[in-house]
Interface confidence: low
Amino acid sequence: ILGGREAEAHARPYMASVQVNGEHLCGGVLVAEQWVLSAAHCLEDAADGKVQVLLGAHSLSQPEPSKRLYDVLRAVPHPDSRPDTIDHDLLLLQLSEKATLGPAVRPLPWQRVDRDVEPGTLCDVAGWGIVSHAGRRPDRLQHVLLPVLDRATCNRRTHHDGAITQRMMCAESNRRDSCKGDSGGPLVCGGVLEGVVTSGSRVCGNRKKPGIYTRVASYAAWIDSVLA
């Protein structure tokens, strides 16, 4: 997260760290007791490593009573996701067992009504992604509030030049932005999961390249079918 600040510890109990061989790779969001939603491209970077999900964490390194690392029973990328595009950039991870819920571990309701978030709405994005020019990674969860940007502006030639589909949404990115390592994490508007940080290699922190988020409401049928 660029231009953000440290999150209040355990105030986002839905927050997940998707890890490979014990290292944070991507963000994720607990959407059901045994399911974490993340970004499909995160799997590409996992190579043949062991994928696990850390729940109940604030610090990645320090012992915390609520922290628990879960093995992944099944990884389900969206069937239409492709390595060369950010379209359909969603991934569902089934945990090896149901998560132990509590104040620091709780699923987040996700938007099912397929309607665009009003431009200008302030939404919260959180993650353990890089926080500096130099690529410094934080140990503790960071967050930032970002205004939603209308799709027409986001699709301007000087911005994303028509690449933003109806199934995506944008947020402003002027120095405050999600970035590398935040992919798969949640964009939360009004306490509801609206978007998932896409995991393309987009430049970040640059006002001319707004943050791109996959709209979960647009994939309600797919999510329900996998969770069923």
Partner: antibody
Framework: EVQLQQSGAELVRPGALVKLSCKAS????????MHWVKQRPEQGLEWIGW????????IYDPRFQGKATITADTSSNTAYLQLSSLTSEDTAVYYC?????????WGQGTLVTVSA | DIVMTQSQKFMSTSVGDRVSVTCKAS??????VAWYQQKPGQSPKALIY???YRYSGVPDRFTGSGSGTDFTLTISNVQSEDLAEYFC???????????FGGGTKLEIK
């Protein structure tokens, strides 16, 4: 039509400084990143740095930190590259360019020759 | 620092042939790669961005591919005007720093 018009060739003494200009037409530099690239005779391309002219924010390749200073004047739609403490190693063609995911437009280049 | 290596400094081909110029990144750069063509005495010209997207006006015989660390610029049906040096370039996702490869000179037999 997008064009980047660079200033003319410079012959400068070692230890001196030089300031090159790149005047843009066909677009507003405030909407883009402006870059400078160095190319020594018969050699490859070296990225020097960029400026976001809207706010003056700059990033440099560490090799050029202290050597190069990039500025921009939005009123004249012009980007500048200043090189200080010149040595023979600075003899090169310097290009300005525009872009972010790639440098879509380039100036014609300015040859700087450092010679006593 | 990320290093972009174009191992072949020179390549020779004939008109009508297909040729592939390769570039290797020292670490994963995703698809953050552009390709440029520079003819003798001219400024570089942008061909490809984001590994595989052609700039407008670039003939479709120029194709970019690759992701991660290995990238290729393929010129099919080579023309005499393709005699030039070709450079790859990577850009970090943040803070947008750039590195060029050393270049590959294409000679037409």
């Amino acid at each position: 039509e997008v064009q980047l018009q660079q200033s003319g060739a410079e012959l400068v003494r070692p230890g001196a400084l030089v300031k090159l200009s790149c005047k843009a037409s066909g677009f507003n530099i405030k909407d883009y990143y402006m870059h400078w690239v160095k190319q020594r005779p018969e050699q490859g391309l070296e990225w020097i740095g960029w400026i976001d002219p809207e706010n003056g924010h700059t990033i440099y390749d560490p090799r050029f930190q202290g050597k190069a200073t990039i500025t921009a004047d939005t009123s004249s739609n012009t980007a500048y590259l200043q090189l200080s403490s010149l040595t023979s190693e600075d003899t090169a063609v310097y290009y300005c360019s525009r872009g972010l995911l790639g440098f879509a437009y380039w100036g014609q280049g300015t040859l700087v020759t450092v010679s006593a | 620092d990320i290093v972009m290596t174009q191992s072949q400094k020179f390549m020779s081909t004939s008109v009508g042939d297909r040729v592939s110029v390769t570039c290797k990144a020292s670490q994963n750069v995703g698809t953050n790669v552009a390709w440029y063509q520079q003819k003798p005495g001219q400024s570089p010209k942008a061909l490809i961005y984001t590994a595989s997207y052609r700039y407008s006006g670039v003939p479709d015989r120029f194709t970019g591919s690759g992701s991660g660390t290995d990238f290729t610029l393929t010129i099919s049906n080579v023309q005499s005007e393709d005699l030039a040096e070709y450079f790859c370039q990577q850009y970090n996702s943040y803070p947008h720093m750039y590195t060029f490869g050393g270049g590959t000179k294409l000679e037409i037999k």
